[in-house]
């Protein structure tokens, strides 16, 4: 695991504890909460990050209309179960034996049930729509400059392959970033769009997960891009299964 060897820290995840007793005497960083070793050369999975967060001391329209099947994360924080690779387990349960199925970004995609609830597979979120509203500026941003800056951000800061940033839409003051990544497209070593979106979301909220780096300073041609609200929609490869009661 490539953690900064000299002072044994994890550049990509501040919610870790690192010690020089990993394989071969190398620096090994463990995610708080789970204790799983993380690869500090890339983003940590959202599941391990959520688990760490829960364990932390209580210290003409060009815009996309989200599909009817798009999910928004309304349930907020919970302490998830992660599999040995750090991914969300398909079935999540709380302390009171209430269970539900989640997608690959950990968002609930079924009604809540009891321990008899079955979640046969972890359904992949293959399309993420990040909907941002920026604070008023002197004028609108140039669309192609904005597009280039956001693509650069996802490539350089989040190490997401450019092919997974499907589109950047802009209608002042609304910006939409579309991330797409099918199961078949994701190769070993590729950053998951769900993880990149989560890091971006935390950056936007001023809660950067990166070690010792300053917060996100987004600028388009020198002009600060300040976000005042964020909505993220998640589209799964298989539509979610909610009862009609929830939809009314």
């Amino acid at each position: 695991h490539t953690a900064a060897q000299d002072n044994c820290t994890c550049p990509t995840n501040k919610m870790t504890v690192c010690s020089p007793d990993g394989p071969g005497g190398r620096c090994q960083c463990r995610a708080l909460g789970s204790g799983m070793a993380v690869d500090c050369s890339t983003l940590t999975s959202k599941c391990l990050l959520l688990k760490a967060r829960m364990s932390a001391p209580k210290n003409a329209r060009t815009l996309v209309r989200p599909s009817e099947h798009a999910l928004v994360d309304n349930d907020g924080l919970y302490d998830p179960d992660c599999d040995p690779e750090g991914r969300f387990k398909a079935r999540q349960c709380n302390q009171t034996s209430v269970c539900w199925c989640v997608n690959s970004v950990g968002v609930r995609r079924t009604d809540k049930g009891d321990l008899s609830l079955r979640c046969d597979e972890l359904v992949r979120t293959h399309h993420i729509l990040i909907d941002l509203r920026h604070r008023p500026t002197a004028g609108a941003f140039n669309h192609s400059d904005l597009d280039a800056e956001l693509r650069r951000l996802f490539r350089e800061r989040y190490r997401l392959h450019p092919k997974f940033v499907a589109a950047v839409h802009y209608e002042q003051p609304t910006i939409q970033i579309e991330l797409r990544q099918n199961t078949s497209q994701k190769a070993a070593g590729d950053v998951d769009i769900g993880d990149a979106a989560y890091y971006f979301e935390r950056d936007i909220k001023g809660e950067s997960l990166f070690q010792g780096r300053g917060g996100l300073d987004l600028r388009v041609r020198g002009e600060p891009l300040q976000v005042e609200r964020t909505l993220i929609y998640y589209l799964d490869e298989i539509p979610p299964k909610f009862s009609m009661k929830r939809l009314t």
Epitope: C8, V17, S19, P20, D21, G22, P23, G24, Q28, R30, L32, S34, G35, M36, A37, D83, P84, E85
Partner: antibody, heavy 115, light 107 residues
């Protein structure tokens, strides 16, 4: 050389709290996890929990979470485990160990809980 | 919690024999498995770390292999000083867990 020196044997009454110590030397105390392990006579090994001295991050085996408290004193490079409300089931040898692969072990502290 | 199952529970051997001790994890733990030897009235001693990495001061007759869920500790030509208990331990995730042990005894 690396050493973990544990406190001496303890005889305590049921219900009376006890605090065991583990003094580390020969390495940078704040850089490695300290773990505590329980072994009842003729039995296997049971992980109680660990503490990372730099930041005092702790993790506990659920079985011990309510009664074991792990702390450190960085100035003396000493780790402590306090066990509250002990019963006869807590009579055992308690080891402190270093790291993730437990490369160094203390000599063990024998705790006897008896009235 | 990750469960480690060691087999056999007891192994009776003659000095000079070569033996293999097994440790199986209830889920994949990559190479985050360590082996210890414990003799009566002593602290355990680390023999092998991270499934196959040798430890300085440990005789070369001890070797480890495996990854994922199946691991083996091999002792090439057992010596009398090797008799005792052997435990495996996982450090893949908290809570860390130990196997129940294999007792290596003289036949």
């Amino acid at each position: 050389q690396v050493q973990l020196q544990q406190s001496g044997a303890e005889l305590v009454r049921p219900g009376a709290s006890v605090k065991l110590s583990c003094k580390a030397s020969g390495y940078t105390f704040t850089s490695y996890w300290i773990n505590w392990v329980k072994q009842r006579p003729g039995q296997g090994l049971e992980w109680i929990g660990n503490i990372f001295p730099s930041g005092s991050y702790t993790n506990y085996n659920q079985k011990f979470k309510d009664r074991a408290t792990l702390t450190v004193d960085k100035s003396s490079s000493t780790a402590f485990m306090q066990l509250s409300s002990p019963t006869s089931e807590d009579s055992a040898i308690y080891f402190c160990t270093r790291g993730s692969g437990f490369d160094y072990w203390g000599q063990g502290t024998t705790l006897t809980v008896s009235s | 919690d990750i469960v480690l199952t060691q087999s056999p529970a007891t192994l009776s051997v003659t000095p000079g024999d070569s033996v293999s001790l097994s440790c199986r994890a209830s889920q994949s733990i990559s190479n985050n498995l360590h082996w210890y030897q414990q003799k009566s009235h002593e602290s355990p001693r680390l023999l092998i770390k991270y499934a196959s990495q040798s430890i300085s001061g440990i005789p070369s007759r001890f070797s480890g292999s495996g990854s994922g869920t199946d691991f083996t500790l091999s002792i090439n030509s057992v010596e009398t000083e090797d008799f005792g208990m052997y435990f495996c331990q996982q450090s893949n995730s908290w809570p860390f867990t130990f196997g129940s042990g294999t007792k290596l005894e003289i036949k």
